[in-house]
């Protein structure tokens, strides 16, 4: 007699960060033969779906046509086979962006630096927020948190060519409501050509300051759910 079902995977398409009034789909993948899926939001039942026919479908989608701050928060899903329910999925933090204002992102000493130089990003927003988020775009989207009354600083320390890329920042009004994104800042790190070719796509940051979101962008990551269960290292919690 089976006593447990593996927990399902949950993710958001196209992204866990959703601009206000835009659409998002929350996906939940369980097992073939699952009779029913339930999506829970902040601990309460939010939606139910029953795949038809169950034996041919192992994923359901919950569509949110119009994102707003009331829909932002923590989602999880469960499914059942017969009357046996799975463990709940990990938590998916769905964030609404483009709220209120736009911060300004700057970088010191400048956007073009030499490998080994110390680089600091500054994110400024004059309205009521004390938490800021710095994101580096790419296959893995790194999120770093910073605090300050109107400005937060994000020291990267001595940079390598792996730090090259496009950065944006957000002001955070709460864990799940973020400002408009800043204008992007492209960081160019020049260095030894041999080192450049060997540089990994993304740098490794100290565990206490950096979390990793593996995003469902057009990177082929959709193929392997285990890789991009958004909540594996959820910085927002």
């Amino acid at each position: 007699q089976q006593q447990t079902l593996p927990k399902p995977f949950i993710w958001a398409e196209p992204h866990f960060m959703v601009p206000k009034e835009k659409q998002v789909t929350i996906c939940c993948q369980g097992n073939y033969g699952a009779v029913e899926y339930q999506l829970h939001f902040e601990g309460s039942l939010f939606a139910v779906d029953r795949p038809k026919p169950p034996e041919r479908i192992n994923k359901v989608q919950f569509y949110i046509p119009d994102m707003n701050s009331r829909m932002a928060g923590q989602y999880s899903c469960i499914y059942r086979v017969g009357e046996l329910w799975s463990e709940p999925s990990n938590l998916l933090d769905l964030v609404v962006t483009e709220m209120y204002d736009t911060p300004t992102l700057s970088v010191h000493p400048g956007p073009e630096v030499i490998s080994g130089e110390k680089v600091t990003f500054y994110c400024r927003l004059d309205t009521a927020t004390s938490m800021f988020l710095l994101l580096k775009e790419g296959r893995s989207s790194h999120v770093q948190r910073g605090y300050g009354k109107v400005q937060a600083e994000f020291p990267l320390g001595p940079v390598t060519t792996a730090h090259r890329g496009t950065y944006r920042c957000f002001g955070s009004y709460n864990n799940h409501a973020w400002s408009f994104p800043s204008e992007p800042v492209k960081l160019l790190v020049t260095g030894d050509i041999e080192n450049t070719s060997l540089a990994p796509e993304d740098p490794t940051f100290p565990a206490d300051t950096w979390g990793t979101y593996l995003l469902t962008t057009e990177t082929g990551l959709q193929k392997d759910h285990a890789l991009w269960d958004h909540t594996a290292q959820n910085l927002l919690r």
Epitope: Q3, V35, E36, P53, P54, V81, E83
Partner: antibody, heavy 117, light 107 residues
Framework: QVQLQQSAVELARPGASVKMSCKAS????????MHWVKQRPGQGLEWIGY????????EYNQKFKDKTTLTADKSSSTAYMQLDSLTSDDSAVYYC??????????WGQGTLVTVSA | DIQMIQSPASLSVSVGETVTITCRAS??????LAWFQQKQGKSPQLLVY???NLADGVPSRFSGSGSGTQYSLKINSLQSEDFGIYYC?????????FGGGTKLEIK
């Protein structure tokens, strides 16, 4: 072996409440949902709802939503059903039933509720 | 709510005969159907789950079949211990609902 031991008889006055118990043994209580089913004398079976003892999450048949409260005590592996504002229509046998991947696979012996002035 | 229409309501048969009880769902329940047997003064017992699968300890003379909205329980070579009331039940949506029951009596 799996056993669901229910309180045998509950007598109550109209308008009162009754809380019946279902003690589970022989399996991991928190791994399976517990459902409740009503059967009036000489009648068929009606599904009331279920509780997930692990999370406390409940789901009810709309017909019984205002009448019934399902709870579970993990420490004693016991599920409870409370019926409020009792009327003669609530006189019935109430079964607790384990929900598994095979459906309703184990049933308690039933609690007979008699509502009488 | 999904309605489960069970027929016949009662049946009078002799030991050794074969009987078929049918259950029709008001919508497709995708084989999420169970059959139960209940004897006088006892709790129901699971016979068949997921439309066709025999529960543990159920004799092979019982068999379930069907799909979509139409399901049936067949009992070959009836034994005296098979008499009682039979119920179908879906576990597709909420609320779970039972058929009205089929009373199987000795002729």
């Amino acid at each position: 072996q799996v056993q669901l031991q229910q309180s045998a008889v509950e007598l109550a006055r109209p308008g009162a409440s009754v809380k019946m118990s279902c003690k589970a043994s022989g399996y991991t209580f928190t791994s399976f949902t517990m459902h409740w089913v009503k059967q009036r004398p000489g009648q068929g079976l009606e599904w009331i709802g279920y509780i997930n003892p692990s999370s406390g999450y409940t789901e009810y048949n709309q017909k019984f939503k205002d009448k019934t409260t399902l709870t579970a005590d993990k420490s004693s592996s016991t599920a409870y059903m409370q019926l409020d504002s009792l009327t003669s229509d609530d006189s019935a046998v109430y079964y607790c039933v384990r929900g598994s991947s095979r459906g309703f696979d184990y049933w308690g012996q039933g609690t007979l509720v008699t509502v009488s002035a | 709510d999904i309605q489960m229409i069970q027929s016949p309501a009662s049946l009078s048969v002799s030991v050794g005969e074969t009987v078929t009880i049918t259950c029709r769902a008001s919508e497709n329940i995708y084989s999420n159907l169970a059959w139960f047997q209940q004897k006088q003064g006892k709790s129901p017992q699971l016979l068949v789950y997921a439309a066709t699968n025999l529960a543990d300890g159920v004799p092979s003379r019982f068999s379930g079949s069907g799909s979509g909205t139409q399901y049936s329980l067949k009992i070959n070579s009836l034994q005296s211990e098979d008499f009682g009331i039979y119920y179908c039940q879906h576990f597709w949506g909420t609320p779970r609902t039972f058929g009205g029951g089929t009373k199987l009596e000795i002729k």
